[in-house]
Structures are given as C-alpha cells and as structure tokens.
C-alpha cells in the first residue's frame, strides 16, 4: 500500500495524464462491497439510478458492476497497481450506458448516462491495498477517493497516511 507522499507523487500528474488507448485493456464483472462487507447496490428511481450501501438479506443477489481497465501513459510506482509499468485507471458501469461519475463540487458519486469517449470524471485510478482491497482515486481530483459516508458513496479527501488505509475508502471485488 501507499504512504500519502507516495499517493501525492503518484497522482500529481493525473490532470495531465491521458489514457493510452480509447479502448479498455480488459474488463471484469464483479460485485462491489465495502471493507465491512456491505453491498453497493443500484436502484432505478424516477428514470435515474440511485446508489446505496446496504446489508443484503441472506441469499439476496448482489448487483454487478463492470470494471473497465485502461492503461495510463503515467508510469506506475507500485507493483500490482499497473500493467507493464503503466498506471491503471478504471471506469465502473452497473448497467449499459451508465457510469459512475465523480462530482467534485458536491463531493458526491453519481450515475450518469453518457456515450464514449467518457469524460475524465468517469475515470478512477485503481490502487491495490491490503487484504485484497482496492481503492478508487478521482482522476480529476488527486487525493480524493470514492468512499462511504452515511450509507451512500461520497468523495472523501485523503490528507494523511493514516487515512489512506481507512476502512471507508476500501472496497472488495468478488464474482459472487
């Protein structure tokens, strides 16, 4: 995992970094849950999707998210976080044509319908953390991560090395 200075160095050039190709290098369909095993779910309400963080009932089916992995031209400084020495970015899509977006003004995570090429707000730097967890850092706002706040996803500013491994920005990916 990273110390905070590592993250800052790693992400300082994010505003300038471009995706190597407009096509993802690979994709993975997974359920997304928090460090504390709460599920991230998506509900269609009034023609828009809402994102929830909740405990599922036993045998209740988990929602899946398509993670699309892109190579950035910006080099990776941590093994396991990149491919061929390049940093990995991801987009997250729970259903066709909808992607998670970072709303930096509102410090919120939202689902928007859009066409490719996707805006920078849909890209997140993937960090492999301890205990098979990952975290997602905003491409548009280095040092800001997707996190959990009041049973919703929110954008959380990480300003110290202790906070980098705090549970509310750690997520688990699983196929089930």
């Amino acid at each position: 995992a990273f110390g905070i200075s590592g993250v800052q160095k790693y992400t300082r050039a994010l505003h300038d970094s471009s995706i190597t190709g407009i096509s993802p290098i690979t994709e993975y369909l997974a359920s997304l849950s928090t460090y504390n095993d709460q599920s991230i779910t998506f509900a269609l309400e009034d023609e828009s999707y809402e994102i929830y963080v909740e405990d599922l009932k036993k045998d209740e089916k988990k929602d899946k998210v398509l993670l699309s992995y892109y190579e950035s031209q910006h080099p990776s400084n941590e093994s396991g976080d990149g491919v061929d020495g390049k940093m990995l970015m991801v987009t997250l899509s729970p259903t066709k044509d909808f992607w998670l977006h970072a709303n930096n003004k509102e410090h919120s995570v939202e689902l928007h319908k859009c066409e490719k090429p996707l805006p920078d707000q849909a890209f997140f730097v993937l960090h492999n953390m301890h205990s098979n967890c990952v975290s997602f850092e905003c491409k548009t706002d280095p040092g800001v991560f997707i996190g959990v706040k009041d049973n919703h996803l929110a954008l959380i500013k990480v300003d110290s090395s202790e906070n980098l491994c705090t549970e509310n920005i750690l997520f688990k990916l699983s196929e089930t």
Partner: antibody, heavy 128, light 108 residues
Framework: ELQLQESGPGLVKPSETLSLTCTVS??????????WGWIRQPPGKGLEWIGS???????YYNPALKSRVTISVDTSKNQFSLMLTSVTAADTAVYYC????????????????????WGQGTTVTVSS | EIVLTQSPGTLSLSPGERATLSCRAS???????LAWYQQKPGQAPRLLIY???SRATGIPDRFSGSGSGTDFTLTISRLEPEDFAVYYC?????????FGGGTKVEIK
C-alpha cells in the same frame, strides 16, 4: 517479463483425450486482472480460439468445441490446463496458451477476448 | 458468428514501402474491439494493435490501426525487413471471437 510455456504429449491417439498445461512465469495468475486462454492453429491454416478462463475458475468456451473442452486453473502452481476429449485428425495443430484481455458485451451478456502475451506453442499430432 | 475477410491474400512490397492491409467484418460492431497480430514462420502470433487503433506495448509507431463498423485497416508506414510476415485481424466484440484468414506480406 511475463512468459508462458505449454507442455504435454506431442502425439495423441484418435478418440483419446488431449491434455496440455500452460505454466506462467514472471507474474501471478491470481493477481492478474487478465484472463488466460488457449488458441490453436492447424498446419498451414489460421487461428482458432478454444476457450478462456479467469483465475477464479470461471470459463468461457468456443461453442464449436464446448462439448469436448475443459479448461481449468491451478493458482498454487501458477498453471492452467486444457483437456480436449474424443480427438480426431482434425485436432492436429499447434496449440498456444496466452494471456487475454476480456471485454464484455452488454447486449449478449458475454465476454470476448484478445490475446496480448503468447506462449511459443506446442505441436500436437493426432494419429494412431 | 462474425466472419472476418482479409485482403489482399498476399501483398508483395519492398522495404521502405507503405503497406495497407484490410479487414472486413460480416456484421458491423460499434465497439471497435478489433485486434491485429503479426506471425512469422515457426513463431507464435504477436499482438500489434487492440481496440482497432491502440498500439500494444513495445510496438513501433510505424504500425497503426484504424477503422470502425465493418471496415478496418492496418498500416505499416515504412516496411522494415523484420515486418515481412503474416498478419491476422481478430474481432472480440462478441463471442465467439473470430480471426481473419490472414494477409501475407512478402518481399517483392
């Protein structure tokens, strides 16, 4: 540097089972975001995808071969394997293992693949 | 399944010349999920291009890919001696993935 190496018998009798193993070095099957797969090339002909697998064991097969193919993974050995049953002379080919990028199609809810790192290939002849 | 037709079957050119290889799909696909491979005799294929236009790691910039829908092109801007080989296109827009029949680029 990631390397893949195929191994297995070069000669298989008709109606028997072809078994090949791919050993991955220079990287872990388990930690990869990629998939793994098998492709074959009959003598003087083009390429045919056989199937792919994720380290979790989830498999994806070519429908034309699905009834005869099993692909499995052993993360402890950093290997994945191919079994092709009831072989005939038409299964004579160079067999390649490869790392694959998997891309999802929302319309058919299926994955398809391209191969970015290949093994050197192993020739398998089906003959009595 | 999607059928890919490559043309020409053989391309005879001299080093330094420009090579243009065509790959046509039987059905249109919107994703541009098309790859190009190079294969030399006795060797495994090598990925050149993915996503129709993205160069794979370590591939020289004389190789470029373009196209969408049903028509895709691989261009080698100036042929080097090591570029004479067979080239395959492959779609991965939908399963099963399929390959074209190949174009052989030979020395004139």
């Amino acid at each position: 540097e990631l390397q893949l190496q195929e191994s297995g018998p070069g000669l298989v009798k008709p109606s028997e089972t072809l078994s090949l193993t791919c050993t991955v070095s220079g990287g872990s099957i388990r930690s990869s975001i990629f998939y793994w797969g098998w492709i074959r090339q009959p003598p003087g002909k083009g390429l045919e995808w056989i199937g792919s697998i994720y380290y979790s064991g989830r498999t994806y097969y070519n429908p034309a071969l699905k009834s005869r193919v099993t692909i499995s993974v052993d993360t402890s050995k950093n290997q994945f394997s191919l079994m092709l049953t009831s072989v005939t002379a038409a299964d004579t080919a160079v067999y390649y293992c490869a790392r694959a990028g998997g891309l999802y199609n929302w319309n058919d809810e299926s994955f398809s693949f391209y191969m970015d790192v290949w093994g050197q290939g192993t020739t398998v002849t089906v003959s009595s | 399944e999607i059928v890919l037709t490559q043309s020409p079957g053989t391309l005879s050119l001299s080093p330094g010349e420009r090579a243009t290889l065509s790959c046509r799909a039987s059905q249109s696909f919107s994703s541009s999920y098309l790859a190009w491979y190079q294969q030399k005799p006795g060797q495994a294929p090598r990925l050149l291009i993915y996503g129709a236009s993205s160069r794979a790691t370590g591939i020289p910039d004389r190789f470029s890919g373009s196209g969408s829908g049903t028509d895709f092109t691989l261009t080698i801007s100036r042929l080097e001696p090591e570029d004479f080989a067979v080239y395959y296109c492959q779609q991965y827009d939908r399963s099963p993935l399929t390959f074209g029949g190949g174009t052989k680029v030979e020395i004139k």
